[in-house]
Interface confidence: low
């Protein structure tokens, strides 16, 4: 009775179970009644990352510098190349096929989390007592100046975009 299912790391073909090729190797010919599955290693620029019956290896991903990409981890015969973005850029998707510049936080917003090669800048509104008067991908909200510690008084209140303006205390004559 020919098999209808095969063990792990095998596949069914022509009513018999053949061994899959191990990661890093491709199928050259199926097994027969008399011969084992024939596999060949992937070439230097190729990979296969699973037990497989693929007749060719996949090309390593190309990290295209024209798209702002650079190699984070070189591929092996069993793993694909991992791309990341150059300084100041981050990936547009999980597969990192292209890059875009990091977002800047507008005045009134500060950086909550600085961007990485794979994630964009996260901005947050400056809460009361803090301000940001610049558009920046790095600056956090800064606290208003404390006039009191300088023996000064607040002459103009601060906002989320401007610092307080301090001035001398009125001296009573």
């Amino acid at each position: 009775e020919p098999p209808t299912a095969c063990r792990e790391k095998q596949y069914l073909i022509n009513s018999q179970c053949c061994s899959l090729c191990q990661p890093g190797q491709k199928l050259v010919s199926d097994c027969t009644e008399f011969t084992e599955t024939e596999c060949l290693p992937c070439s230097e620029s190729e990979f296969l990352d699973t037990w497989n019956r693929e007749t060719r290896c996949h090309q390593h991903k190309y990290c295209d510098p024209n798209l702002g990409l650079q190699v984070q981890q070189k591929g092996t015969s069993e793993t694909d190349t991992i791309c990341t973005c150059e300084e100041g850029l981050h990936c547009t998707s999980e597969s990192c096929e292209s890059c875009v510049p990091h977002r800047s936080c507008l005045p009134g917003f500060g950086v909550k989390q600085i961007a990485t090669g794979v994630s964009d800048t996260i901005c947050e509104p400056c809460p009361v007592g803090f301000f940001s008067n610049v558009s920046s991908a790095f600056e956090k909200c800064r606290p208003w100046t404390s006039c009191e510690t300088k023996d000064l008084v607040v002459q103009q209140a601060g906002t989320n975009k401007t610092d307080v303006v301090c001035g001398p205390q009125d001296r009573q004559r």
Partner: antibody
Framework: QVQLQESGPGLVKPSETLSLTCTVS????????WSWIRQPPGKGLEWIGS???????NYNPSLKSRVTISVDTSKNQFSLKLSSVTAADTAVYYC????????????WGQGTLVTVSS | EIVLTQSPGTLSLSPGERATLSCRAS???????LAWYQQKPGQAPRLLIY???SRATGIPDRFSGSGSGTDFTLTISRLEPEDFAVYYC?????????FGGGTKVEIK
């Protein structure tokens, strides 16, 4: 736009070796698999084999003992040799470029008819 | 090797009609690995559909592909005069890649 052009003798004697060359223009031969496919007059298509620009080959088991495919990256060409031909090898021979990860063929030459006859 | 059987062998239809072509595989083929080609007399085949349902560059949307496992279909929603040709399916999952015997779509 990639273009492929087959060249070689249109008539080959039985038992001799059929030799064809495919010249690739409009793009580099590097980074792709390149295939030979044939079609006997009035019949269907048969994949003969393919080669990667690095020289790694795959052949159809039904023809494997008689087929050699080679590549010359400096000339942007790849070639087919089929030995010990018979009248059954009379066909239009096409060269084609494979897609990136799969063996289907987005680009084809126009084909060249090879007749095996004495 | 995987054998692909195409039916019907010949389909006689008029321009404007819908054409449905079948391709049956002798064993299961993941839809990622199935393609369709069109061939006109004296010309090389042209890739129409890959991955069972994705249209190749420049192919009009009247061509569509579907199916999975062992049964695949190419549909031409409204036949244009230039669509009368022979159509081949191809599987590229298992070594060696194989083509179906073709379906000729002819003018009725």
């Amino acid at each position: 736009q990639v273009q492929l052009q087959e060249s070689g003798p249109g008539l080959v004697k039985p038992s001799e070796t059929l030799s064809l060359t495919c010249t690739v223009s409009g793009g580099s031969i590097s980074s792709y698999y390149w295939s030979w496919i044939r079609q006997p007059p009035g019949k269907g298509l048969e994949w003969i084999g393919s080669i990667y620009y690095s020289g790694s080959t795959n052949y159809n088991p039904s023809l494997k003992s008689r087929v050699t495919i080679s590549v010359d990256t400096s000339k942007n060409q790849f070639s087919l040799k089929l030995s010990s031909v018979t009248a059954a090898d009379t066909a239009v021979y096409y060269c084609a470029r494979d897609a990136n990860y799969y063996k289907w063929h987005p680009y084809w030459g126009q084909g060249t008819l090879v007749t095996v006859s004495s | 090797e995987i054998v692909l059987t195409q039916s019907p062998g010949t389909l006689s239809l008029s321009p404007g009609e819908r054409a449905t072509l079948s391709c049956r595989a002798s064993q299961s083929v993941s839809s990622d690995y199935l393609a369709w080609y069109q061939q006109k007399p004296g010309q090389a085949p042209r890739l129409l559909i890959y991955g069972a349902s994705s249209r190749a560059t420049g192919i009009p949307d009247r061509f569509s592909g579907s199916g999975s496992g062992t049964d695949f279909t190419l549909t031409i929603s409204r036949l244009e005069p230039e669509d009368f040709a022979v159509y081949y399916c191809q599987q590229v999952l298992s070594y060696p890649p194989t083509f179906g015997g073709g379906t000729k779509v002819e003018i009725k």
